[in-house]
């Protein structure tokens, strides 16, 4: 559409420019005035003037292409005809003058002959001579005037020739422009066809989108009914759960009573037995070494603190003892969170969650840890990246990531930019881009500008996971637009 408009405009501009040049050449001729002084008589000839004001208000008259010459040329021809008429009138007037003189002379001669006396012959001869002289003088004057007129006519002919040359030039320009206009019209019609084709395509696409929407609505209503059923089941489960909790509470009370009884009897036997210390674990490796070798959620304690955190421990993969610090698997948890939330952690340790930057920072600054990132795509493939040394700086340094020694199957180059970057969230912009990567790509991550990875991006389901700039990305395995199906980030002491 815009191309068409552009061509139409340029076409008008070309014509307007040509027209203005033509007007300038006409203006340079201007109004010429010739004055001839002869005796007591003065003859003034006004040559025709080019009148620019009367041209059409439109810069280009639509039918001008079909004309033999521009409008100004017609004016010139008309003015020349007027001049020729004037000259013809002059000639007739001169002839009348001659006739009048001749008639007068004849009359005077007859009178002289009738009234003359012999002795007046000399006077009469003198008068005759004077009249002849006067006639000769008049004839000379007429000859001069004729010469002047001839002169002007020659000049006009020259100007006319010049005009016809410039007219030819203009005609050629107009013809060129006409062919240019035809070309542009062809181009326009081609573009119009293209636009129409695109419109048709667009209508088809809209139709398919509408169909998809209808299908989705059906799906949504199905899901709603499923959700309703699940809610009912949850209510039942909750009731059952509360019953179980009560039973568990009763059991615990019984166990505690038994323990109290046992400890009472034991202390009676041996008063030196100390109260058993509460065991706390810093990470899943310690949990594993204490004999708990099943996967699940365990309570970990911050180093040098009583503060606790719940984490999922993978006790099977690669020898076990892995503390899961991030998991994505189904899009059930929103990862577009605040700095505070990424600091303390969020989500559900048994499903999608982020363990918490503060805990990971404190943990990884106590001893050397390895980081393993396990990835799954939508085609059933799996890959991993293993960093032999990983730690996070403190919050004061924006939890900057530090990584060394990459191995694994998810790309030979690290998809987490090296050297490590500061952590950024939607409300804590610490990246190297003038944009705000976390706001643009969603999720908190160690963005560069914005970098080749973001495992906390938007979760896209299958068949919607390609060409996504803000998805779950690990560039050196799947490229920039591919959003992964599942990711797990896990840490373990290097000396495990």
């Amino acid at each position: 559409m815009w191309q068409i408009v552009f061509f139409t405009l340029s076409c008008d501009l070309v014509l307007a420019a040509a027209y203005n040049n033509f007007r300038k050449s006409m203006d340079s001729i201007g109004k010429k005035q010739y004055q001839v002084q002869h005796g007591s008589c003065s003859y003034t000839f006004l040559l025709p003037e080019m009148d620019n004001c009367r041209s059409s208000s439109s810069p280009y008259v639509s039918n001008a292409v079909q004309r033999d010459a521009p409008l100004e040329y017609d004016d010139s021809v008309q003015r020349l005809q007027v001049l020729e008429n004037i000259m013809e009138n002059n000639t007739q007037w001169l002839m009348k003058l001659e006739n009048y003189i001749q008639d007068n002379m004849k009359k005077e001669m007859v009178e002289i002959q009738q009234n003359a006396v012999q002795n007046q012959t000399a006077v009469m001869i003198e008068i005759g001579t004077n009249l002849l002289n006067q006639t000769a003088e008049q004839t000379r004057k007429l000859t001069d005037v004729e010469a002047q007129v001839l002169n002007q006519t020659t000049r006009l002919e020259l100007q006319l020739l010049e005009h016809s040359l410039s007219t030819n030039k203009l005609e050629k320009q107009i013809l060129d422009q006409t062919s240019e206009i035809n070309k542009l019209q062809d181009k326009n019609s081609f573009l119009e066809k293209k636009v129409l084709a695109m419109e048709d395509k667009h209508i088809i696409q809209l139709q398919s989108i509408k169909e998809e929407k209808d299908q989705l609505q059906v799906l949504v209503s199905k899901q709603n009914s499923i959700i309703e059923e699940l809610e009912k089941k949850i209510v039942t489960a909750t009731v059952n759960n509360s019953v179980l909790q009560k039973q568990q509470h009763d059991l615990m009370e019984t166990v505690n009573n038994l323990l109290t009884m046992m400890s009472t009897s034991n202390s009676a036997k041996d008063p030196t037995v100390a109260k058993e210390e509460q065991i706390s674990f810093r990470d899943c490796a310690e949990v594993f070494k204490s004999g708990h070798t099943t996967n699940g959620i365990y309570t970990l304690t911050f180093p040098n603190s009583t503060e606790e955190i719940k984490a999922y421990c993978d006790m099977e993969a690669g020898g076990g003892g892995w503390t899961i610090i991030q998991r994505r698997e189904d899009g059930s948890v929103d990862f577009q969170r605040t700095w505070k939330e990424y600091k303390v952690g969020f989500g559900n340790p048994s499903g999608e969650y982020w363990l918490g930057n503060e805990f990971v920072s404190q943990l990884t600054n106590q001893q050397r840890y390895v980081l393993k990132i396990h990835l799954k795509d939508w085609e059933g493939n799996e890959a991993y990246s293993l960093y032999e040394h990983f730690y996070l700086s403190s919050e004061e340094l924006n939890y900057r990531i530090h990584l060394k020694g990459l191995t694994g199957t998810a790309g030979k180059i690290s998809s987490i930019s090296q050297p490590g970057n500061d952590f950024s969230t939607k409300d804590g912009d610490n990246d190297k881009c003038i944009c705000k990567c976390s706001q643009m790509l969603t999720g908190g991550w160690w963005f560069d500008a914005c970098g080749p990875s973001n495992l906390n991006g938007m979760y896209y389901p299958q068949r919607q996971n390609t060409n996504k700039f803000n998805g779950i990305k690990w560039y050196y395995w799947k490229g920039s637009g591919y959003s992964l199906k599942a990711t797990t980030m896990m840490i373990r002491p290097a000396d495990f």
Epitope: E307, T338, K340, V344, F346, T425, K426, D427, Q439
Partner: antibody
Framework: QVQLQQSGAELVRPGTSVKMSCKAA????????IGWVKQRPGHGLEWIGD????????NCNEKFKGKATLTADTSSSTAYMQLSSLTSEDSAIYYC?????????????WGQGTLVTVSA | ENVLTQSPAIMTASLGQKVTMTCSAS???????LHWYQQKSGASPKPLIH???NLASGVPARFSGSGSGTSYSLTISSVEAEDDATYYC?????????FGGGTKLEIK
């Protein structure tokens, strides 16, 4: 220094809405969260929600969802809170407050408060 | 939500006396996100202590804070007349932020 200037007291009819403002000065408006706190006599302080003007993000106390709408105009460095379907329960002093995104210092700065009285 | 319970609700102290008020959380709170505010009659609340034990600017050294997990406290080593106010604890362990009901300190 940091200043949070709140709009004047409002006397409103039940069922209507009220929109109060909090004009910030002395800091970069888009870098800090603006929170809103309600105080009723004998009820202590209640957090309504907060907004991050740098992206228009909001967090809201479930209790005030449907009641409070938080907005911010970065061009005038002003945060707004609109309360709808007012009842006598909404008669209170409403404070705006500022906090760093890390929130290490809590609500570091407070406005002078806007008194809203809902009465027929 | 994490409910904060302050005790006592009202306390009376003599000038120069040491007073301690407590704030108990229904679930664990990170010490980074436990703060105290002072509100004098007819005024807006003002920050007193942030991150459990750090004094806000301009706060006298007679104020101190401590605690971890679910139990936190605020202590005034030697009460002065200007300390007549209501003191609120506030936490963030995930949304929503919550405040305690307040402890009103009256000076004899």
């Amino acid at each position: 220094q940091v200043q949070l200037q709140q709009s004047g007291a409002e006397l409103v009819r039940p069922g209507t809405s009220v929109k109060m403002s909090c004009k910030a000065a002395g800091y970069t408006f888009t870098d800090y969260w603006i929170g809103w706190v309600k105080q009723r006599p004998g009820h202590g302080l209640e957090w309504i929600g907060d907004i991050y003007p740098g992206g228009g993000y909001t967090n809201c106390n479930e209790k005030f969802k449907g009641k409070a709408t938080l907005t911010a105009d970065t061009s005038s460095s002003t945060a707004y809170m609109q309360l709808s379907s007012l009842t006598s329960e909404d008669s209170a002093i409403y404070y705006c407050s500022r906090s760093d995104y890390r929130n290490d210092e809590g609500f570091a700065d407070w406005g002078q408060g806007t008194l809203v009285t809902v009465s027929a | 939500e994490n409910v904060l319970t302050q005790s006592p609700a009202i306390m009376t102290a003599s000038l120069g006396q040491k007073v301690t008020m407590t704030c108990s959380a229904s679930s664990s709170v990170s010490s980074s996100y436990l703060h105290w505010y002072q509100q004098k009659s007819g005024a807006s609340p003002k920050p007193l202590i942030h991150r459990t034990s750090n004094l806000a600017s301009g706060v006298p050294a007679r104020f101190s804070g401590s605690g971890s997990g679910t139990s936190y406290s605020l202590t005034i080593s030697s009460v002065e007349a200007e300390d007549d106010a209501t003191y609120y604890c506030q936490q963030w362990s995930g949304y929503p932020y919550t405040f305690g009901g307040g402890t009103k300190l009256e000076i004899k």
